[in-house]
């Protein structure tokens, strides 16, 4: 084996494991990984007497190198004394030496958390004549700490006698207060509370916050619609900047990802509004998998006239998930509007609030412009709800009297969609051959007296259909009963509406 100098490690006990009445204590020095023999270990004990013992070297099995330990036992006033272990290895070089200086025992310590708190403004958002900054130095293992206040990096002449320290359990906290004039605070200087502890400096800084956004200009970043995400599988997010004053200099919208991975190519659109302002949008295609796995996307807006960049970020909504319940209804015929009907769809109790609503007729999706859907609103519980409204014409329902309301939502299983069909005339199902065979179970109004079915939407249920007890396999809500068909024969007529 070739010549190898040793690594040297101090060996100490934990302070809390040494009895307070101990009259002597032993510490050590480990020299390991050296070749060839020997090493020479000496101790500097200052003014204290001590006895040393160097153990015979042992061979490290795998490398063939050596290790040895030297022990020092001291008595008397050892508690605050520092000791130096000096290891020499002449085979490495005649002057090869490593010194380790340490105390008898090691204290494991928790460093402080430093936080500056600021006195609040008055009710109108104005600063009072003086501003108080409070430096909280918390959660550290008791020991000497020094607090210094800095203004723009320069030490301030502050009376620190007001600093107070408290101890809770094994940890201590200290606080120091700094009072500033309003003029100093508004001058945009940075104030730093600097804490020195165990040979390290911990700090927190603060200054008067700039206005949270440049006045007048707003930026918004949308999440992808569930339809684009789960059905089209080509999700996009859009960064929208509004109320820009048309001026020289370009508005820059820059996309980035929190993971640092590259972003796709974005498309940009500028529109001049009637009020003279400029609206800029940038649309970025995102990876379906990246989005679902929780990637964060950032849009950064810069412009020569903005005092600072606007930053917006978006990511998949966190929190609990709940699939939507979908209910579709047709309004009764209204006098004077025989050739038009309104269909309504209530979608409720879903979480999170991102949802896409579509209407289908003849298995074809109707254009979004045909229907109007509210923004998600909170229910009294923890979920959200929307209403969607669709106007249909007689020509449509005579062609096929079945319209489908479909909700696309991440919590809906198995395919992120839930849908319900609705007919304008549920009892006269469109005159097609299908009308002879409808489902053998339909919903009843809750609390309906058994055997007395009730007409809904102006049509008449079959006399032999009655409201039976709720069925576990019926997909509707539990408070609704089931209409059970009692007809006999090969092709019985069934009631397809509400009882």
């Amino acid at each position: 084996a070739s010549t190898q100098s040793p690594s040297v490690f101090p060996l100490t006990r934990c302070c809390k494991n040494i009895p307070s009445n101990a009259t002597s204590v032993t510490l050590g020095c480990l020299a390991t990984g050296y070749f060839p023999e020997p090493v020479m270990v000496t101790w500097d004990t200052g003014s204290l007497n001590g006895t040393t013992m160097t153990l015979p070297a042992t061979t490290l099995t795998l490398s063939g190198h050596y290790a040895t330990i030297s022990l020092l036992t001291v008595s008397g006033a050892w508690a605050k004394q520092m000791f130096t272990c000096r290891v020499a290895h002449t085979p490495s070089s005649t002057d090869w030496v490593d010194n380790k200086t340490f105390s008898v025992c090691s204290r494991d310590f928790t460093p402080p958390t430093v936080k500056i708190l600021q006195s609040s403004c008055d009710g109108g958002g104005h600063f009072p004549p003086t501003i108080q900054l409070l430096c909280l130095v918390s959660g550290y293992t008791p020991g000497t700490i020094n607090i210094t206040w800095l203004e723009d990096g320069q030490v301030m002449d502050v009376d620190l006698s007001t600093a107070s320290t408290t101890q809770e359990g094994e940890l201590a906290s200290t606080q120091s207060e700094l009072t500033l004039s309003q003029k100093h605070w508004l001058s945009d200087r940075t104030y730093t509370c600097q804490v020195t502890y165990q040979g390290h400096t911990f700090e927190d800084s603060t200054k008067k916050c700039a206005d949270s956004n440049p006045r007048g200009v707003s930026a918004y970043l949308s999440r992808p619609s569930p339809f684009d995400l789960f059905i089209r599988k080509s999700p996009t997010i859009t960064c929208l900047v509004v109320d820009l004053a048309p001026s020289k200099g370009t508005v820059n919208l820059t996309w980035s990802r929190a993971s640092g991975k590259p972003v796709n190519h974005s498309t940009r659109k500028e529109e001049k509004q009637r009020n003279g302002t400029l609206t800029v949008t940038s649309t970025l295609p995102v990876g379906t998998r990246d989005w679902i796995e929780g990637e964060t996307y950032q849009c950064r807006v810069t412009h020569p006239h903005l005092p600072r960049a606007l930053m917006r970020s978006t990511t998949k909504t966190s929190g609990p998930r709940a699939a939507p319940e979908v209910y579709a209804f047709a309004t009764p015929e209204w006098p004077g509007s025989r050739d038009k009907r309104t269909l309504a769809c209530l979608i409720q109790n879903f979480m999170p609030e991102d949802i896409s609503v579509q209407w289908l007729h003849n298995e074809v999706q109707l254009p979004d412009a045909r229907h109007s859907t509210t923004q998600p609103r909170k229910t009294k519980g923890s979920g959200f709800f929307v209403f969607s409204r669709l106007e249909v014409t007689r020509a449509e329902w005579e062609q096929k009297d079945e319209f489908i309301c479909r909700a696309v939502h991440e919590a809906a299983s198995p395919s992120q969609t839930v849908q319900r069909a609705v007919s304008v005339n549920p009892g006269l199902a469109g005159g097609s051959a299908q009308s002879q065979r409808a489902p053998d179970r339909v919903l009843c109004h809750s609390g309906q007296q058994q055997g007395l079915p009730r007409a809904a939407g102006g049509s008449v249920p079959h006399p032999r259909c009655h409201c039976g007890a709720g069925r576990a396999d019926w997909p509707g809500p539990p408070e609704l009963d089931v209409c059970v068909e009692e007809a006999e024969g090969e092709a019985p007529w069934t009631w397809t509406g509400l009882c």
């Epitope: 928790t110 958390t113 700090e203 927190d204 800084s205 640092g260």
Partner: nanobody
């Protein structure tokens, strides 16, 4: 996992300046997830030692080793997922390999090597 990539090291004369950068990336790394970032250094034949640390979320919470206080400044840019170490008034004893490291879960800025979980490969700084 978190990946850390240092850059900006090099040869500089005593009294000069250097700015080191550390780019953080990875599926679990987001600037809001409570990471603490630190710079350590290791000179030949010496142990790795703490230089400076910063909290991602606040950015104003920092810690420095006494030997670099007033000369080195740690900062971060959330948008770029990058931590910087600005080193001024460099001395020959600042010569070392400088490592970027990430820790998570502490309310304070950690200063001990064992508290940091993720490490970069290091960048050499030589002060002549």
């Amino acid at each position: 996992d978190v990946q850390l990539q240092e850059s900006g090291g090099g040869l500089v004369q005593a009294g000069g300046s250097l700015r080191l950068s550390c780019l953080a990336s990875g599926r679990t790394f987001t600037t809001t997830s409570g990471y603490n970032m630190g710079w350590f250094r290791q000179a030949p034949g010496k142990e790795r030692e703490f230089v400076a640390g910063i909290k991602w979320v606040s950015g104003s919470n920092r810690a420095y080793a006494e030997s670099v206080k007033g000369r080195f400044t740690i900062s971060r840019d959330n948008a770029k997922n990058t931590v910087y170490l600005q080193m001024n008034s460099l001395k020959p004893e600042d010569t070392a390999v400088y490592y970027c490291a990430a820790a998570t879960g502490q309310s304070y800025v950690p200063i001990r090597e064992y508290e940091y979980v993720y490490w970069g490969q290091g960048t050499q700084v030589t002060v002549s």
